[in-house]
């Protein structure tokens, strides 16, 4: 079998949902010594980056300026060390937002409910779209989808204090082109008397996995790697 290097990790810096005309940044984390990284878009080569010096950095950032629907879709990356290529990374979905109009989000029976009550979110957008998306702040990867002509409903079932937090919805023109976000709706769920004040709310800061952790190799890292390699050989 043809030898390949381990697959790189692809990430979107700050968010995978990029407002139109703004810049997206994708990071490809591969290996120290990689001489070339390639970013692929929908199966075709999109961009190339050659780190300098290659032995001192374990990945690259690809900047995609002026985001629009032509650049929204599935991205992956690969890297090369010498003549040897890596496996392809997992796919990353890059979405363009702030297209066309703004939906309205409402919640029934209301934004303040008791634990165990059934809650339904309604997302309405008068322009022609068939897919709607509901996201919870701090949980942007957990997208709920629903379908409807101008309005979609998102039944939550009996809620718990874990459902507390801020929600937004989008209308979607295709999987990768979304409307402006709705105004947020904050759901407050009061639990049993003894745990009402203790129930945690979800963080409102950006998702922790949407960060690029590229590192430059220091002399110390190099010495440690060499020491580890020597130790492994001695153990053999």
């Amino acid at each position: 079998p043809k030898q390949t290097l381990p697959k790189p990790i692809i990430r979107a810096e700050s968010t995978y949902m990029v407002p139109k005309e703004k810049q997206a940044t994708l990071c490809c984390q591969g290996s120290y010594g990689a001489v070339e990284y390639q970013l692929h878009f929908e199966g075709s080569l999109f961009a190339v980056e050659r780190p300098k010096p290659p032995e001192r950095i374990n990945g690259v950032k690809f900047h995609i300026p002026d985001m629009n629907s032509r650049k929204a879709g599935r991205y992956s990356c690969i890297y090369r060390v010498g003549e040897l290529w890596s496996e392809r990374s997992d796919l990353l979905d890059l979405v363009v937002t702030e297209m066309y109009d703004t939906p309205t989000l409402s919640v029934h029976p209301g934004p303040e409910v008791t634990s165990g009550e059934k809650v339904t979110f309604y997302c309405r957008l008068d322009t022609a779209t068939s897919m709607f998306l509901l996201l919870k702040e701090g949980r942007s990867r957990d997208v709920q989808r629903s379908y409807g002509k101008v309005q979609a409903e998102f039944p939550m079932g009996p809620v718990t204090t874990a459902h507390r937090g801020s929600y937004r919805c989008f209308g979607s023109y295709n999987n990768y082109a979304w409307s402006f976000p709705s105004e947020p709706v904050k759901l407050l769920v009061t639990g049993d008397i003894e745990n009402t004040s203790l129930a945690p709310t979800d963080p409102t800061f950006p998702d922790s996995w949407d960060t690029c952790l590229l590192t430059r190799e220091t002399g110390l890292q190099k010495d440690l790697a060499l020491w580890d390699h020597t130790a492994q050989n001695l153990l053999r």
Epitope: E49, K61, R70
Partner: nanobody, 126 residues
């Protein structure tokens, strides 16, 4: 706003050479990644060559070793030196720019480019 104007196209015999130029207006040229694409009659636009803001280059397999892309930031111009021309190189050649860019990225996909020239025709025939 960036404006790109190509020149240098014309008719040439197989095996001949041509140098295309692309003059860019605006002060953003030094921070732009540049590329050349071409479109033959009845075919889709295809990538030819690209250059990053720090002079890294990338070529389509079909032109590798025959075409050279270069840039002159002082003149706000990118060049495509074409040699050993073949009949299949006949096309309208377009210059394109990605503005702004950061780092050392070379852009290959046409969707990456946000500014385009009007094109210059290159005809290779005996």
């Amino acid at each position: 706003e960036v404006q790109l104007v190509e020149s240098g196209g014309g008719e040439v015999q197989p095996g001949g050479s041509l140098r295309l130029s692309c003059a860019a207006s605006g002060r953003t040229f030094a921070s732009a990644a540049m590329g050349w694409f071409r479109q033959a009659p009845g075919k889709e636009r295809e990538f030819v060559a690209a250059i990053s803001r720090s002079d890294d280059t990338y070529y389509a397999e079909s032109v590798k070793g025959r075409f050279t892309i270069s840039r002159d930031n002082a003149k706000n111009t990118v060049y495509l030196q074409m040699s050993s021309l073949r009949a299949e190189d006949t096309a309208v050649y377009y210059c394109a720019a990605v503005v702004p860019t950061y780092g050392n990225t070379i852009y290959v996909h046409s969707a990456a480019y946000n500014y385009w020239g009007q094109g210059t025709l290159v005809t290779v025939k005996p």
